[in-house]
């Protein structure tokens, strides 16, 4: 059962796995949630009654029964991991801790104007986990305004002490705020020959890469496939680092693959969610339970529902035994990965899906795209919303995209003449406008946030956020789309679609059924040639066929230009403006979302 509240002056007895240091009980809970085995924790706050060496200790605990005896202790704060909860979890921690020195390896020292600048420096440094900044009131003159970047093996401080006039905080890489490049390339027949910080077993290079991405010290990895000649190293995933942050060299080795941590774009890729099944593969580990199950899918469900289960192996039923049910072995290990992987025994293995909630919802796979035709089908574009105005009468005004459970991203020009958010209604999960009746449920708009540099669509900054009055419960027909990663600026999107209920030609009417069109991106240079009278800035992106014929049009404004990359859909553009509709050599112009990621996060993550 999910218990979110913290238990003051309470200590859980026993079950210790490890002790880490965290600046708050809240962050201790996050660390526990992300730890492969932690189900409960006890944090010790600073208190005159406690030994200062025990201040800020966060003891991670496990229990077969999922609970432990409680003992009263002043300054102790205990609680449960969010693993038991169904809500979305994030490792993002923007808090700044005043008068706390978070200890670690100080590998970089420089002058910074503010704690915010220091935090930004940490976020954009590949090694940095957290920082301590000496404010201008710091007693020692030579240390004032010094920004210390720090890292540790675990990503958490090795100790935390009280120190006047300093502030500390964490890297915001997990908040999607890093400008570090995202190197998505996987290198076949390649070994990176740098220091191994850890090694785990993985069924393929993709799982190895995901493990590297959420491991605090891993910057790149090498994976030895099941065909690797040395049997003892098959399926071995080596997690690596180097001083420069990049591999020092590459060595060619057959049946090995190498790649990079995707920590700076982890918000738009699945990192914790290993949803594939591995056939003819057995995962070894500590056995939690053996249950009868009809299929490997059913076995995965059982594992997902058992809070301590990390992975499983399903052995199909022999002929008509046991009512056609096979054996489902629920397993766990100290690090969440199998202790060994065996092939050729007929098992089907996989991982719990419980950790999928630690990934952004936007990375969830959706229905396969319907090829051909222009009309969409239900659930094809679950982030697309129709924004209605009720004044003077109710009508479709613009499109928009769900980017969070309370947030819609759309175009600023949609709100010309809109005096109040009260006249707006957001409908999600809609395919046909005709579905919208008097009693159709909608989301009211609490706030319209228009970019403060917006003047008119053609001059850019055509972007706006709608904060909804209530939260969206994600389903197959309404779920968010990922924002592009700032580290992915070099990605070339080749599978891009524009959707909306807008006109199909210049003089037309709003369409009943959501329309879709696959449209190629056009370089800004090429686009500029087509719009000599306008300035096509890097904050705009263009798409269209040279010969015309397919384009967004009136009524599509604010809707998404959605591009699929590595099996994940990204909101690359917001329909903004163009000359006519689908005209020859007149591409559509869209707001280039990647250039506004900071603005979006600043507005949506504001406390």
């Amino acid at each position: 059962e999910c218990v979110t509240q913290l238990l003051k002056d309470t200590c859980f007895e026993g079950g210790d796995i490890t002790t880490v240091f965290t600046p708050s009980a809240k962050y201790c809970q996050v660390v526990c949630t992300y730890h492969p085995r932690c189900l409960l924790f006890t944090f010790t706050a600073e208190s005159p009654s406690e030994d200062p060496t025990r201040w800020f200790t966060c003891v991670l605990k496990d229990s077969v029964t999922e609970t432990l005896p409680r003992v009263n202790r002043t300054a102790a704060i205990s609680g449960y991991s969010f693993k038991q909860c169904s809500h979305q979890i994030s490792a993002c921690n923007k808090d700044i801790y005043v008068d706390l020195d978070m200890k670690g390896i100080n590998y970089n020292s420089s002058v910074a104007k503010s704690a915010q600048e220091c935090q930004e420096r940490c976020t954009d440094d590949v090694h940095c986990h957290f920082f301590t900044y000496a404010t201008r009131q710091f007693p020692s003159l030579e240390h004032r305004n010094i920004c210390l970047l720090k890292h540790t093996q675990t990503g958490t401080p090795t100790r935390i002490t009280k120190l006047d006039k300093v502030v500390s905080g964490f890297s915001l890489k997990s908040c999607a705020l890093s400008n570090l490049a995202c190197i998505r390339d996987i290198f076949p027949n390649t070994v990176f020959a740098d220091s191994n910080i850890d090694s785990v077993m993985a069924p393929d290079a993709f799982v190895c890469g995901r493990i590297c991405t959420h491991h605090p010290g891993c910057l790149f990895f090498t994976f030895f496939s099941q065909e690797w000649p040395k049997e003892s190293q098959r399926n071995l995933c080596l997690l690596k680092t180097s001083e420069s942050g990049l591999p020092s060299t590459r060595i060619k080795k057959s049946k090995a693959l190498s790649g990079f941590s995707l920590q700076s774009c982890r918000h738009s890729i699945p990192v914790f969610c290993h949803s594939s099944f591995y056939h003819d593969t057995d995962f070894l580990g500590e056995e939690l339970d053996i249950v009868a199950a009809k299929s490997h899918e059913a076995c995965q469900k059982l594992c997902t529902n058992a809070v301590r289960c990390q992975f499983f192996t399903y052995t199909p039923a022999q002929a008509s035994c046991n009512e056609g049910k096979g054996k489902c072995y629920l397993k766990l290990s100290s690090n969440g990965s199998p202790t060994k992987i065996l092939h050729g025994r007929g098992g089907i293995s996989g991982y719990t899906l419980r950790l999928c909630k630690m990934d952004n919802e936007c990375t969830t796979k959706i229905k396969p795209r319907i090829v051909g035709g222009t009309a969409s089908v239900r659930g094809e574009w679950p982030w697309q919303v129709t924004l209605h105005t009720t004044s003077p009468t109710q009508r479709h005004l613009c499109g928009g995209s769900i980017i969070g459970n309370q947030w819609i991203l759309t175009a600023a020009h949609c709100f010309y003449g809109v005096e109040s958010p009260k006249i707006l209604r957001v409908y999600s999960g809609i395919l046909n406008q005709s579905e919208i009746k008097e009693d159709t449920s909608f989301f009211g708009v609490q706030e319209i946030i228009i970019h403060d540099q917006y003047k008119m669509a053609e001059s850019g900054y055509d972007i706006a956020l709608l904060k909804l009055e209530t939260t969206v419960n994600y389903t197959d027909s309404q779920r968010p789309i990922c924002l592009p990663s700032k580290g992915d600026r070099n990605v070339i999107y080749t599978d891009c679609w524009v959707t909306g209920w807008g006109y199909r030609k210049l003089r037309d009417k709003i369409q009943n059924t959501l329309q879709k069109a696959k449209i190629p991106l056009v370089t800004n240079e090429e686009c500029q040639k087509r719009y000599r009278g306008h300035k096509i800035t890097h904050k705009m992106i263009c798409a269209g066929y040279r010969e015309g014929g397919k384009d967004a049009c009136k009524g599509d404004s604010g809707g998404p230009l959605s591009c699929k990359h590595n099996e994940v859909w990204h909101l690359v553009g917001i329909t903004s403006w163009g000359e006519g509709c689908a005209q020859r050599e007149r591409p559509g112009v869209y707001t280039n979302v990647v250039e506004y990621v900071d603005w979006i996060l600043e507005k949506t993550q504001a406390v």
């Epitope: 995202c182 190197i183 390339d185 290198f187 020959a193 060595i251 060619k252 070099n490 990605v491």
Partner: antibody, heavy 118, light 107 residues
Framework: EVQLLESGGGLVQPGGSLRLSCAAS????????MAWVRQAPGKGLEWVSS????????LYADSVKGRFTISRDNSKNTLYLQMNSLRAEDTAVYYC???????????WGQGTLVTVSS | DIQMTQSPSSVSASVGDRVTITCRAS??????LAWYQQRPGKAPKLLIY???TLQSGVPSRFSGSGSGTDFTLTINSLQPENFATYYC?????????FGQGTRLEIK
């Protein structure tokens, strides 16, 4: 058909700078690792630099490290080599090439001559 | 860095002959070796990779062998267009290094 077309070569004084470009066509440029290889007059081949498809990782020969910068613009299907602090020993024909999974240079451009002389 | 040494530095042969060029690595490189052909005034062309695998479109009269430190390129039944300079390249690790080249001339 794969085509790689280098440009930007010419005569430059020692200590000067030059930027080479390589326009690619006939293949999905953003899927390929790219490299620059040079050949001094009458001499053998020397690998200069490589860049991964995403552009996020670059490698250099010791002889050019800190002076040359390789980059790419996947939207323009173009590879670049920015050469600073040029020396007489940098005089060569500079080839742009694709680097394949075979760990060989699969396709080459026709080359552009860079002459560093006072 | 791995040094590559080719021998001979030049060789004369006639059309129809069989020619062998050798390449030695300063340390073991498994079978990670490539061979290139370069005609005068032209760009190099990949002939063989992984010591013995023919690049597509390359005539079968070219063959490669060897592993570890010693490798050979053999050209059977020389044709006029085969007179060129040949380079070996180690594909074991970065930095990538080439041999100094072997010039194949008409006798």
């Amino acid at each position: 058909e794969v085509q790689l077309l280098e440009s930007g070569g010419g005569l430059v004084q020692p200590g000067g700078s030059l930027r080479l470009s390589c326009a690619a066509s006939g293949f999905t440029f953003s899927d390929y690792e790219m490299a620059w290889v040079r050949q001094a007059p009458g001499k053998g081949l020397e690998w200069v630099s490589s860049i991964v498809p995403s552009g996020g990782w670059t490698l250099y020969a010791d002889s050019v490290k800190g002076r040359f910068t390789i980059s790419r613009d996947n939207s323009k299907n173009t590879l670049y080599l920015q050469m600073n602090s040029l020396r007489a020993e940098d005089t060569a024909v500079y080839y742009c090439a694709t680097w394949g999974d075979s760990w060989g240079f699969d396709f080459w451009g026709q080359g552009t001559l860079v002459t560093v002389s006072s | 860095d791995i040094q590559m040494t080719q021998s001979p530095s030049s060789v004369s042969a006639s059309v129809g002959d069989r020619v062998t060029i050798t390449c030695r690595a300063s340390q073991g490189i498994s079978s990670w070796l490539a061979w290139y052909q370069q005609r005068p005034g032209k760009a190099p062309k990949l002939l063989i990779y992984d010591a013995s695998t023919l690049q597509s479109g390359v005539p079968s009269r070219f063959s490669g062998s060897g592993s570890g430190t010693d490798f050979t390129l053999t050209i059977n039944s020389l044709q006029p267009e085969n007179f060129a300079t040949y380079y070996c390249q180690q594909a074991d690790s970065f930095p990538i290094t080439f041999g100094q080249g072997t010039r194949l001339e008409i006798k």
